[in-house]
Interface confidence: medium
């Protein structure tokens, strides 16, 4: 099938790193500088991304692959392959349209970055709060009151809490 | 589970408008986006909003896109106005998680922009 192919469109023999000259008789030609192609038998060559500004270079662009970006310090990721950068707030903070602001009571943001997210609900998995939840934390879940019976060790560990970045809707 | 499913897509002439929407569920979202991918080409971003209003566009689309989110039906929108054949793409809704460190993908909408 592939020499059928071939046969058909030449270009599908030029590989990663070339591209498919039309001007030059449909021979396979280099990826000119700063620009690449991941895959074989394509016409053009991607423009190479450039990490200017915000963003730093985390891999160099080749022949066969676009350069990856990420943030200077002080900035995050966001989106996919790091489409954007944002600036860092505390922990116990989250990045609003008038800069960074402190997470509202009953919410917390244990990172520089994200949002705050609400304190896990212990009640609803029938456990109290064993620690208070702060900005920064979220609160401990342990078991309820109920759940000690007469001459139980009251140093049972607790429960774990929940996995950070799962709360409830 | 995470679910982002697109709609919205479709023909549309040259100068035209569409409204691309994304119905989100499963997490609790910092930051939702839009990107597309033209055929044989590269995905590319289009433009963010965050879950307190803040937005951001690409070069290309800034000043006919507008992009939009409803946090009580965990929806995102796409309005697109003066629309150009190199709008043409399959449009993709994403979603970062509630810390910034995972990307959700819808399955994409196809676009076409053809007299």
């Known amino acids: 099938f592939e020499r059928t192919r071939s046969l058909q469109d030449p270009c599908s023999n030029c590989p990663a790193g070339t591209f498919c000259d039309n001007n030059r008789n449909q021979i396979c030609s280099p990826c000119p500088p700063n620009s690449f192609s991941s895959a074989g038998g394509q016409r053009t060559c991607d423009i190479c991304r450039q990490c200017k500004g915000v963003f730093r270079t985390r891999k160099e662009c080749s022949s066969t692959s676009n350069a990856e970006c990420d943030c200077t310090p002080g900035f995050h990721c966001l989106g996919a392959g790091c489409s954007m950068c944002e600036q860092d707030c505390k922990q116990g903070q989250e990045l609003t349209k008038k800069g960074c602001k402190d997470c509202c009571f009953g919410t917390f943001n244990d990172q520089k970055r994200g949002i705050c997210r609400p304190w896990t609900n212990c009640s609803l998995d029938g456990k109290s709060v064993l620690v208070n939840g702060t900005k920064e934390r979220d609160v401990v879940c342990g078991p309820s009151p109920a759940d000690l019976s007469p001459g139980a060790s009251s140093v049972t560990p607790p429960a774990p809490a929940r996995e950070p970045g799962h709360s409830p809707q | 589970q995470v679910q982002l499913v697109e709609s919205g897509g479709g023909l549309v002439q040259p100068g035209g408008s569409l409204r691309l929407s994304c119905a989100a569920s499963g997490d609790i979202f910092s930051i939702m986006f839009w990107y597309r991918q033209p055929q044989g080409k590269q995905r590319e971003y289009v433009a963010h909003?965050?879950?307190?209003?803040?937005?951001n566009y690409a070069d290309s689309v800034t000043g006919r896109f507008t992009i939009s989110r409803d946090n009580n039906k965990n929806t995102l929108y796409l309005q697109m106005d003066s629309l150009r054949a190199e709008d043409t793409a399959v449009y993709y809704c994403a979603a970062d998680d509630a810390t910034n460190t995972r990307t959700y993908w819808g399955q994409g909408t196809l676009v076409t922009v053809s007299s």
């Open positions: 909003i965050t879950s307190n209003g803040r937005t």
